[in-house]
């Protein structure tokens, strides 16, 4: 391959070349959450649409039972947005009553589960106090970063309050990952 | 090419190899929006700087008339941040007056237009209620995710209130996409 | 290499092919900030964990003295999240007292320093007014975009108020970059 002779001189070893089109990738979109049993002491995990509309999984990246299954070791960019909506938190009322005031909050966590490791690893967390004046509020939390994952790792999205997740539109709440 | 022998054994077919440097990419930055005619029943689209300062388009990714034009089918990572700024929303006043209260809101949508398809597709939406106590407020909405796009698809960024977009600095409001 | 014959016909010149696994990459995570001297008229820069826990640097991307050092020219995706937390801003009190009201704010800037250029370049800015009703507030600002960088460029993350940064967990506040 002629072009290879221009490869940077610092590339001392030949690493495997990869066609970009065959890398594991997934973009999952929100579905209405049905009440399920959640693990104790852990935020509930969302489940996702993986093939309809904008959602897809490809190149051995599979979705099963709330988890994205990592088919190949490497560095992945992982992202999620969760849009929350709710009624006024009690925050302002509590404040007006002059009592000390722990604000309500919304939290999203992207979690990695490795079968050989007893505890899940929190990769990303977005957490926000909610102390709204208006009677209805809504807002997104977005997360995204790169992580080194191992074949067999599983990824999920946990939220602090599953009943506040806006499940109405696939563009509002989503979860994805791709091998770099 | 020696390194190829280490390619993962699951790569059953030869996919085309691609030099990363020649992939379609763009990062667009905010410019001041002058009053224009917008489509009825659709949030107004922002127009962008595509060559000055931090902005660029490359490898056949072109910007024209508020649209990024996708030159090649594939999986793209698409992102945008819009910083909004405004004066106090009427929200708190309405609440004080004891009337029911629909909060003001700010919304960003990244939209795909496919000529062969009659309706635009909303890829990403960030929407937030704004019910601020202070007299001046400002805040960003960030979006980013991966989508499978087709050659000829067009991308744009729509906002709920074009007059609240902070156009003063190229690092506050931007829009980009790149082929993975 | 057999697969190459399927390369897009528009690829007129052979660009160097690159194994994805040897591209410069880094994901840095928050550490407690020790009081240091900051440059006048510039927001203070955060320093980071670069090797423990989720943090890593690889393929000649080095972290030193608050900076990520770019080892190779190209297009990079750069991202950061900073989670802030604080007590009530004086904003609502000022408003109630009927005095004019400049809201408190939180700001994150990802900055590029080029030795041959006298002024740092602000690549990304997330800025938000903070005018909370509750007594304790917390919230993240997320940023991410693609930029063309030159070998030797340095990246840092600056914040408006270093004492408000949540340094308690590596998943809440982080900074990363990778060559596309």
């Amino acid at each position: 391959l002629k072009g290879q002779e221009f490869a940077p001189s610092h590339q001392q070893v030949y690493a495997p070349l990869r066609a970009d089109g065959d890398k594991p990738r997934a973009h999952l979109t929100v579905v209405r959450q049905t009440p399920t049993q959640h693990f104790k002491n852990q935020f509930p995990a969302l489940h996702w649409e993986h093939e309809l509309g904008l959602a897809f999984t490809k190149n051995r990246m599979n979705y099963t039972n709330k988890f994205l299954l990592i088919p190949e070791s490497g560095d992945y960019f992982i992202y999620s947005q969760v849009t929350f909506r709710g009624m006024t938190s009690e925050c302002s009322e509590i404040r007006q009553a002059g009592r000390p005031n722990k604000p309500d909050s919304i939290t999203v966590v992207i979690t990695k589960v490795t079968d050989s490791y007893p505890e899940p690893t929190q990769l990303l967390m977005g957490t926000k106090s909610v102390c709204e004046v208006g009677s209805n509020w809504f807002q997104p939390i977005y997360l995204g970063a790169m992580f080194s994952l191992q074949e067999g790792d599983k990824l999920m999205v946990n939220v602090s309050d599953i009943s506040l997740v806006d499940y109405t539109k696939e563009d509002k709440t989503f979860f994805g990952a791709f091998l770099l | 090419l020696k390194g190829q022998e280490f390619a993962p054994s699951h790569q059953q077919v030869y996919a085309p190899l691609r030099a990363d440097g020649d992939k379609p990419r763009a990062h667009l930055t905010v410019v001041r929006q002058t009053p224009t005619q917008h489509f009825k029943n659709q949030f107004p689209a922002l127009h962008w700087e595509h060559e000055l300062g931090l902005a660029f388009t490359k490898n056949r990714m072109n910007y024209t008339n508020k649209f990024l034009l996708i030159p090649e089918s594939g999986d793209y990572f698409i992102y945008s941040q819009v910083t909004f700024r405004g004066m106090t929303s009427e929200c708190s006043e309405i609440r004080q007056a004891g009337r029911p209260n629909k909060p003001d809101s700010i919304t960003v949508v990244i939209t795909k237009v496919t000529d062969s398809y009659p309706e635009p597709t909303q890829l990403l939406m960030g929407t937030k209620s704004v019910c601020e106590v202070g007299s001046n407020w400002f805040q960003p909405i960030y979006l980013g995710a991966m989508f499978s796009l087709q050659e000829g698809d067009k991308l744009m960024v729509n906002v709920s209130d074009i007059s609240l977009v902070d156009y003063t600095k190229e690092d506050k409001t931007f829009f980009g996409a790149f082929l993975l | 290499l057999k697969g190459q014959e399927f390369a897009p016909s528009h690829q007129q010149v052979y660009a160097p092919l690159r194994a994805d696994g040897d591209k410069p990459r880094a994901h840095l995570t928050v550490v407690r900030q020790t009081p240091t001297q900051h440059f006048k008229n510039q927001f203070p820069a955060l320093h980071w964990e670069h090797e423990l826990g989720l943090a890593f640097t690889k393929n000649r991307m080095n972290y030193t003295n608050k900076f990520l050092l770019i080892p190779e020219s190209g297009d990079y995706f750069i991202y950061s999240q900073v989670t802030f937390r604080g007590m009530t801003s004086e904003c609502s009190e000022i408003r109630q007292a009927g005095r004019p009201n400049k809201p408190d704010s939180i700001t994150v800037v990802i900055t590029k320093v080029t030795d041959s250029y006298p002024e740092p370049t602000q690549l990304l800015m997330g800025t938000k007014s903070v005018c909370e009703v509750g007594s304790n507030w917390f919230q993240p600002i997320y940023l991410g975009a693609m930029f063309s960088l030159q070998e030797g460029d340095k990246l840092m993350v600056n914040v408006s108020d270093i004492s408000l940064v949540d340094y308690t967990k590596e998943d809440k506040t982080f900074f990363g970059a990778f060559l596309l």
Epitope: - | R32, Q33, T34, P35, T36, Q37, H38, P44, G86, M87, E90, S135, N136, D161, I162, S163, L164, V165, D166, Y167, T168, K169 | P100, K102
Partner: antibody
Framework: QVQLVQSGAEVKEPGASVKVSCKAS????????MHWVRQAPGQGLEWMGW????????NYAQQFQGRVTMTRDTSISTAYMELSRLTSDDTAVYYC???????????WGQGTMVTVSS | DIQMTQSPSSLSASVGDRVTITCRAS??????LNWYQQKPGKAPKFLIY???RLQSGVPSRFSGSGSGTDFTLSISSLQPEDFATYYC?????????FGPGTKLEIK
């Protein structure tokens, strides 16, 4: 192209009210804030307030509070500014102006001269 | 309210000269500073926004700089059509306020 066309000159007596109109064309009227700015003879520019044509929400400068009313009729893309209890100090050219953002004035009307005289 | 001051209040210059007008805000207004040009009997014309960004269609001989409280408008090589009054305006918070103006006259 974007145009703002204002109503004609007015002569009013002290204590009266004046209502100036501003017809917009060439852009989506409801998408951009409409401002009113006045200029007394030989003086500088003074911002009076804005109306958000979409919601009808207004923001008036303190010195005009209680005397000014800004309204709009979206069906005919027209904004109105009414100033009451006029005094000779209100003699000025009144401009409507629209901005691509709410904090600046891209396009101005031709101005309406209001003279307050007994 | 944020007070805006301009200096000088008037300025005589010749075609081809470089001129600078300064504008100061009574408190920080970040980059939310706009400049306008007004000729006698006409409505103002929008020149510069965000302290330094040229409105489309404005000649490149005009430039702006500054942030916080101190700002400048420069014209690199005066043309006959540039003789007018120039106003700065803060868009940081309401009430929006203008500077008193700088009258640029032919020497």
């Amino acid at each position: 192209q974007v145009q703002l066309v204002q109503s004609g000159a007015e002569v009013k007596e002290p204590g009266a009210s004046v209502k100036v109109s501003c017809k917009a064309s060439g852009y989506t009227f409801t998408a951009y804030y409409m401002h009113w700015v006045r200029q007394a003879p030989g003086q500088g520019l003074e911002w009076m307030g804005w109306i958000n044509p979409n919601s009808g929400g207004t923001n008036y400068a303190q010195q005009f509070q209680g005397r000014v009313t800004m309204t709009r009729d979206t069906s005919i893309s027209t904004a109105y500014m009414e100033l009451s209890r006029l005094t000779s100090d209100d003699t000025a050219v009144y401009y409507c102006a629209v901005g691509g953002s709410y904090d600046a004035f891209d396009i101005w009307g031709q101005g309406t001269m209001v003279t307050v005289s007994s | 309210d944020i007070q805006m001051t301009q200096s000088p209040s008037s300025l005589s210059a010749s075609v081809g000269d470089r001129v600078t007008i300064t504008c100061r805000a009574s408190q920080s207004i970040s980059s939310y500073l706009n400049w306008y040009q007004q000729k006698p009997g006409k409505a103002p014309k929008f020149l510069i926004y965000g302290a330094s960004r040229l409105q489309s269609g404005v000649p490149s001989r005009f430039s702006g700089s500054g942030s916080g409280t101190d700002f400048t408008l420069s014209i690199s090589s005066l043309q006959p059509e540039d003789f007018a009054t120039y106003y700065c305006q803060q868009g940081h918070s309401t009430p929006f306020t203008f500077g008193p103006g700088t009258k640029l006259e032919i020497k």
